[in-house]
């Protein structure tokens, strides 16, 4: 299987992980976290990094702590820097994580999913049009 295909699988897997965590929003610490939305073009990877850095945490209540902690840790899996597309070129002009609106876990996860969907769409489009961006 090609690296590009594996990359797509990993991105879709992240969406599934977000979906799983959405089942447990009541078991997450109700902390407000930077949640990028309407991310400008070429800042997607920067925003992705902000989502990964956010301190999403299990509230350690109930019996779902294990699956929550495993899922959060898998959400933070770092893609290789070569996959970051134009991330390096445009990083200086992208908003800092702190500048994004802070949202509770439910909205944080919804916005993360939205960004992942956008990135997958862009990735597919760039492949269709022969671009080297991934």
């Amino acid at each position: 299987m090609q690296g590009q295909d594996r990359h797509m699988i990993r991105m879709r897997q992240l969406i599934d992980i977000v979906d799983q965590l959405k089942n447990y929003v009541n078991d997450l610490v109700p902390e407000f976290l930077p949640a990028p939305e309407d991310v400008e073009t070429n800042c997607e990877w920067s925003a992705f990094s902000c989502f990964q850095k956010a301190q999403l945490k299990s509230a350690n209540t109930g019996n779902n702590e294990r699956i929550i902690n495993v899922s959060i840790k898998k959400l933070k899996r770092k893609p290789p820097s070569t996959n970051a597309g134009r991330r390096q070129k445009h990083r200086l002009t992208c908003p800092s994580c702190d500048s994004y609106e802070k949202k509770p876990p439910k909205e944080f996860l919804e916005r993360f999913k939205s960004l992942l969907q956008k990135m997958i769409h862009q990735h597919l489009s760039s492949r269709t049009h022969g671009s080297e961006d991934s």
Epitope: H7, R10, Q13, D16, Q20, R66, I67, K73
Partner: antibody, heavy 126, light 106 residues
């Protein structure tokens, strides 16, 4: 080929200790989380413990928490299960299993246990 | 913690017949987190299906998985003699197993 081989099982008295080992070969051991799963005679599968690929996190079933310790030595491609304060209900075949989700972004991506050892039998009896 | 309930406990069928095994979760499970295993007597389990519907490497296409939310199904389209075994579903991440369904020869 990809292989897991458990050892260290045996007959032990209640309250005593035992250490199981699982030797891995045929794959990059340090890129995979690892599990211990057990099966009591005539019963179903029971997950016991999991360790992250780099040993940074460990998780345990409630039935063994505080008594069992999972560890790994990536330089030796070996997984361990230290079992203390053993009870009769710990009698089972113990399997080590590889977690199918590699730490490598381009690696395996299976949310499941994709490689299993043949098992080692632990009998706790006085 | 999530509980996975498999049904039926035992399925008595003949070779060539279709087997339908059910796995019901006590709370919603993302499809990616649901796996199925096969275990034959005296052998270690084998991963059959991951992500609720994807066959693991080397698994024949007579095995298929489906479902979402709380209801998942493993289907064996035409039972071969080597398919008579115990089947377990599992939620990834909590690593909870169902109690198993035994598929035996009628």
């Amino acid at each position: 080929q990809v292989q897991l081989v458990e050892s260290g099982g045996g007959v032990v008295q209640p309250g005593r200790s035992l250490r199981l080992s699982c030797a891995a070969s045929g794959f990059t051991f340090s890129s995979y989380g690892m599990h211990w799963v057990r099966q009591a005679p005539g019963k179903g599968l029971e997950w016991v413990a999991f360790i992250w690929y780099d040993g940074s996190d460990k998780y345990y079933a409630d039935s063994v928490k505080g008594r069992f310790t999972i560890s790994r030595d990536n330089s030796k491609n070996t997984l361990y299960l230290q079992m203390n304060s053993l009870r009769a209900e710990d009698t089972a075949v113990y399997y080590c299993a590889r977690d199918g989700d590699s730490s490598d972004w381009y690696g395996d991506y299976y949310f499941g246990m994709d490689v299993w050892g043949q098992g080692t039998t632990v009998t706790v009896s006085s | 913690e999530i509980v996975l309930t498999q049904s039926p406990g035992t399925l008595s069928l003949s070779p060539g017949e279709r087997a339908t095994l059910s796995c019901r979760a006590s709370q919603s499970v993302s499809s990616s987190y649901l796996a199925w295993y096969q275990q034959k007597p005296g052998q270690a389990p084998r991963l059959l299906i991951y992500g609720a519907a994807s066959r693991a490497t080397g698994i024949p296409d007579r095995f298929s998985g489906s479902g979402s939310g709380t209801d998942f199904t493993l289907t064996i389209s035409r039972l071969e003699p080597e398919d008579f075994a115990v089947y377990y579903c599992q939620q990834y991440g909590s690593w909870t197993f169902g109690q198993g369904t035994k598929v035996e020869i009628k």
